[in-house]
């Protein structure tokens, strides 16, 4: 008995071939011997089966001795043994229809779980293997679960259902709703304007929701809400903003915030959350601000950084075009009695400068100038 696998919602064509290459009488029946369709001369006749409005054949092939049964918009319950009666012969074809669906929605928040459920006919024992867009394979039976979805899981998932050594492939498009970056870090000299950007990693027709930026300053004991906003059809409107600092927010996507001045008291970490309409859970992006200050007080030239720096970073003070006078894995370094000239304070990661601040040291009888 021939086995054919079909996909729910698709069309399947079951073949039936006579030895004579001409149009002769044929009938298709189901396992209950109920006639589905057949012919009477050159006319197609249909029986009283449930497939009535979804069953068809190809009259153009009859003259070649081919009498296919076409079933449109397949349903799981169409799984059955179909019998083609032609030339006193009976050809049996077992049709097994499978369906694969994603739980609730194919638009899921980063960190949520994706569950794929296989609908299969009674008596079948299929195995399923799915390949994610990033090439990760998962296997299972009736259900497959992927916890903690990541941004790279966005795209087409290809799932293969295997039954009786035959396979049928499903493609499911999954959109992981997330920010492009989970975390970002901004390095600024004291007094500079700070730009925070929060680009989304997906595009949808209409985007509605609300968001908030909570900030934990390094110097503060508790976190504070810096701004709350609404998002309506990709338009941003500020609901509430603190007076210190007074952030400004762009009116269009991507979400964009401006801090007028980088100051040591603002250095720290923020968490921007975005709650989307009709979605449970929130999108998150962490943002960090590191602020550098170079100062000269009497005979002491000091360079300091505030904010979430890594222990890998090196802080150095050097006279322009000279070797570093001091270079340590600290958040503050200093030089006593610095010689006159342009001094550079450098924050670097493995030799790569992340942040630089210059301070001019004048001969001892003058006061320092900050460029």
């Amino acid at each position: 008995k021939k086995v054919v696998l079909g996909k729910k919602g698709d069309t399947v064509e079951l073949t039936c071939t006579a030895s004579q290459k001409k149009s002769i009488q044929f009938h298709w029946k189901n396992s209950n011997q109920i006639k589905i369709l057949g012919n009477q001369g050159s006319f197609l006749t249909k029986g009283p089966s449930k497939l009535n409005d979804r069953a068809d054949s190809r009259r153009s092939l009859w003259d070649q001795g081919n009498f296919p049964l076409i079933i449109k918009n397949l349903k799981i319950e169409d799984s059955d043994t179909y019998i083609c009666e032609v030339e006193d012969q009976k050809e049996e074809v077992q049709l097994l229809v499978f369906g694969l669906t994603a739980n609730s929605d194919t638009h899921l928040l980063q960190g949520q779980s994706l569950t794929l459920t296989l609908e299969s006919p009674p008596g079948s024992s299929p195995s399923v293997q799915c390949r994610s867009p990033r090439g990760k394979n998962i296997q299972g039976g009736k259900t497959l679960s992927v916890s903690q979805l990541e941004l790279q899981d966005s795209g087409t998932w290809t799932c293969t259902v295997l039954q009786n050594q035959k396979k049928v492939e499903f493609k499911i498009d999954i959109v992981v709703l997330a920010f492009q970056k989970a975390s970002s870090i901004v390095y600024k000299k004291e007094g500079e304007q700070v730009e925070f950007s929060f680009p989304l990693a997906f595009t949808v027709e209409k985007l509605t929701g609300s968001g908030e930026l909570w900030w934990q300053a390094e110097r503060a004991s508790s976190s504070k809400s810096w701004i709350t906003f609404d998002l309506k059809n990709k338009e941003v409107s500020v609901k509430r903003v603190t007076q210190d600092p007074k952030l400004q927010m762009g009116k269009k996507l991507p979400l964009h915030l401006t801090l007028p001045q980088a100051l040591p008291q603002y250095a720290g970490s923020g968490n921007l959350t975005l709650a989307l309409e009709a979605k449970t859970g929130k999108l998150h992006q962490e943002v960090n601000l590191v602020v550098m200050r170079a100062t000269q007080l009497q005979k002491n030239l000091t360079c300091e950084v505030w904010g979430p720096t890594s222990p890998k970073l090196m802080l150095s003070l050097k006279l322009e075009n000279k070797e570093a006078k001091v270079s340590k894995r600290e958040k503050a370094v200093w030089v006593l009695n610095p010689e006159a000239g342009m001094w550079q304070c450098l924050l670097s990661d493995s030799g790569q400068v992340l942040l630089e601040s210059n301070i001019k040291v004048l001969p001892t009888w003058s006061t320092p100038v900050q460029p």
């Epitope: 720096t309 222990p311 890998k312 970073l313 090196m314 150095s316 570093a324 001091v326 270079s327 340590k328 894995r329 600290e330 958040k331 503050a332 670097s348 990661d349 493995s350 030799g351 790569q352 400068v353």
Partner: antibody, heavy 120, light 113 residues
């Protein structure tokens, strides 16, 4: 697996220059800084400097400033160390060493070493 | 520059016995900002490059046997081999990476008594 493969031994005359290469494989080349460390025969280890392959920026030990140049070729995942104005005391095994994941100063993978002999 | 001074220069220990190597830095390598000691220990066998054993003064590199341990803080550091094996015969170096230039100790040669 991570591998650092260095160029072969060199014999140079005083005053000449030498260029040693170090080809990296088994990891993302631009994600880890590379250091150069030398070891004179029967002596200890001496740090020469560092290159950050992602931007090409360098930092050299004061002792070698003006004589050493570290470069990289991201297309071949190779770093180079050129030492000029060679003298007999530069005779040593030169190692490239990848910076570790943690403190950016501990070296978790080393090349096999390149012996540079300076002799008239 | 920070000077790293190792002692002893050489050490002969019986198989299965404890070996202790000391390293002293000329100034503290404990970062007050990050509360970390920027000290690493390496093992070097003849004709081979050094091999990282310990970083952050006391964290063992993956794949390093647990008979190797590091301790100390500030300016005084110790590498201990709890039960010396034949394959541990080598020269051991300490290194600071708190400040540039990065510097190494002079090395301690460990032999079997």
């Amino acid at each position: 697996q991570v591998q650092l493969v260095q160029s072969g031994a060199e014999v140079k005359k005083p005053g000449a220059s030498v260029k040693v290469s170090c080809k990296a494989s088994g990891y993302t080349f631009t994600s880890y800084a590379m250091n150069w460390v030398r070891q004179a025969p029967g002596q200890g280890l001496e740090w020469m400097g560092i290159i950050n392959p992602s931007g090409g920026s360098t930092s050299y030990a004061r002792k070698f400033q003006g004589r050493v140049t570290m470069t990289r070729d991201t297309s071949t995942s190779t770093v180079y160390m050129e030492l000029s104005s060679l003298r007999s005391e530069d005779t040593a095994v030169y190692y490239c060493a990848r910076e570790g994941d943690y403190g950016s100063g501990e070296f978790d993978y080393w090349g096999q070493g390149t012996l540079v002999t300076v002799s008239s | 520059d920070i000077v790293m001074t190792q002692s002893p220069d050489s050490l002969a220990v019986s198989l299965g016995e404890r070996a202790t190597i000391n390293c002293k830095s000329s100034q503290s390598v404990l970062s007050s900002s990050y509360n970390k000691n920027y000290v690493a220990w390496y093992q070097q066998k003849p004709g081979q490059p050094p091999k990282l054993l310990i970083y952050w003064a006391s964290t063992r590199e993956s794949g390093v046997p647990d008979r190797f341990s590091g301790s100390g803080s500030g300016t005084d550091f110790t590498l201990t081999i709890s039960s010396l094996q034949a394959e541990d015969v080598a020269v051991y170096y300490c290194q600071q990476y708190y400040s540039t230039p990065l510097t190494f100790g002079g090395g301690t040669k460990v032999e079997i008594k």
